[in-house]
Amino acid sequence: QGGTRSPRCDCAGDFHKKIGLFCCRGCPAGHYLKAPCTEPCGNSTCLVCPQDTFLAWENHHNSECARCQACDEQASQVALENCSAVADTRCGCKPGWFVECQVSQCVSSSPFYCQPCLDCGALHRHTRLLCSRRDTDCGTCLPGFYEHGDGCVSCPTSTLGSCPERCAAVCGWRQMF
């Protein structure tokens, strides 16, 4: 009491850092610093992040919370997880759509847009890999269809149509003229 030197940070526990005159306990995630502690090893005055803002980590210096991001509707993004006091909104794509990164070196924070997944069924193909982080990977033609050019063509239903070699192998027809 009555001294003039501010104390060194030798408080019990490791979550004290110097803020101004004193070593203070920081604010937990989801809270911002309203005022630093007023005595050695004291608790700072921390307030909960207001709605639509967040702070993900314990902190000693943030006097305001970060604004939650809004998912980009123009890019067909949707909120997979709503923003909370401790975590930002997690944006992604709705079922049946996949993430297409807008930069070549893609990381989790990279800008992206959502693309509709290929519908293998509509292309008369097997689904080899379901669409999630990348587009659907379609496989071979469904039964009753054969490879022709880039697509799957329906097996002829009568002997009147022509059935090339690949058709014959799949559809069980010999080539007819």
């Epitope: 501010s6 101004g20 005159l21 007023t38 005595e39 005055t45």
Partner: antibody, heavy 116, light 107 residues
């Protein structure tokens, strides 16, 4: 709106005593450290004393140590400075100020004159 | 005690001028430095805390920079209402200490 209003200043003879008060409003007084800062006529600012939010920790400038006592009453939202054994060099405007790292709000000041 | 050396002690400038005041601490104070404006007969007003953070409502022509021992306060374009005395103050350590002030006047 944060407001700090000092009172209790006046003229006193050397060796005399005065008690300054600072009435706080517009904020949660019990969450903030408070200080007294003074300014002699035509001079710069000089920090005098500091008290923690709970009143449990007090600090003083060497020039007033042993003569001045800082205290607070959180129930009354009030800060005090008891000044004893006053000297001519204590003549100044005395400001109370709220500590939030820096001193972000100040009162208008009260003049203390120590003269025979 | 940490000694705060402010310079110049007074300066005269014209409206629109860029004005710079410096403050030097006798030891490292990190960024625990504030700047105040005091007009005659009034209480000091906090302009900048943590060396560079502008207080809410303070015009953007005021700015601060520096850390450690050397700090600068700048008014980018002097206005008539900026006539005042400016003080730096450290709050890294007790006792809290102020610079001796810089009196700013209009030419």
């Amino acid at each position: 709106e944060v407001q700090l209003v000092e009172s209790g200043g006046g003229s006193v003879q050397p060796g005399g005593s005065l008690r300054l008060s600072c009435a706080a409003s517009g904020f949660t007084f019990s969450s903030y450290g408070m200080s007294w800062i003074r300014q002699a006529p035509g001079k710069g600012l000089e920090w005098v004393s500091y008290i923690s939010s709970s009143g449990g920790h007090t600090y003083y400038a060497d020039s007033v140590k042993g003569r001045f006592t800082i205290s607070r009453d959180n129930a009354k939202n009030s800060l005090y400075l008891q000044m004893n054994s006053l000297r001519a060099e204590d003549t100044a405007v005395y400001y109370c100020a709220r500590y939030s790292g820096a001193f972000d709000h100040w009162g208008q000041g009260t003049l203390v004159t120590v003269s025979s | 005690d940490i000694v705060m050396t402010q310079s110049p002690s007074s300066l005269s400038a014209s409206v629109g001028d860029r004005v710079t005041i410096t403050c030097q601490a006798s030891q490292d104070i990190s960024n625990y430095l504030s700047w105040y404006q005091q007009k005659p007969g009034k209480a000091p007003k906090l302009l900048i805390n943590d060396a560079s953070n502008l207080e809410t409502g303070v015009p953007s022509r005021f700015s601060g920079s520096g850390s450690g021992t050397d700090f600068t306060f700048t008014i980018s374009s002097l206005q008539p209402e900026d006539i005042a005395t400016y003080y730096c103050q450290q709050y890294d350590n007790l006792p809290i200490t102020f610079g001796q002030g810089t009196r700013l006047e209009i030419k």
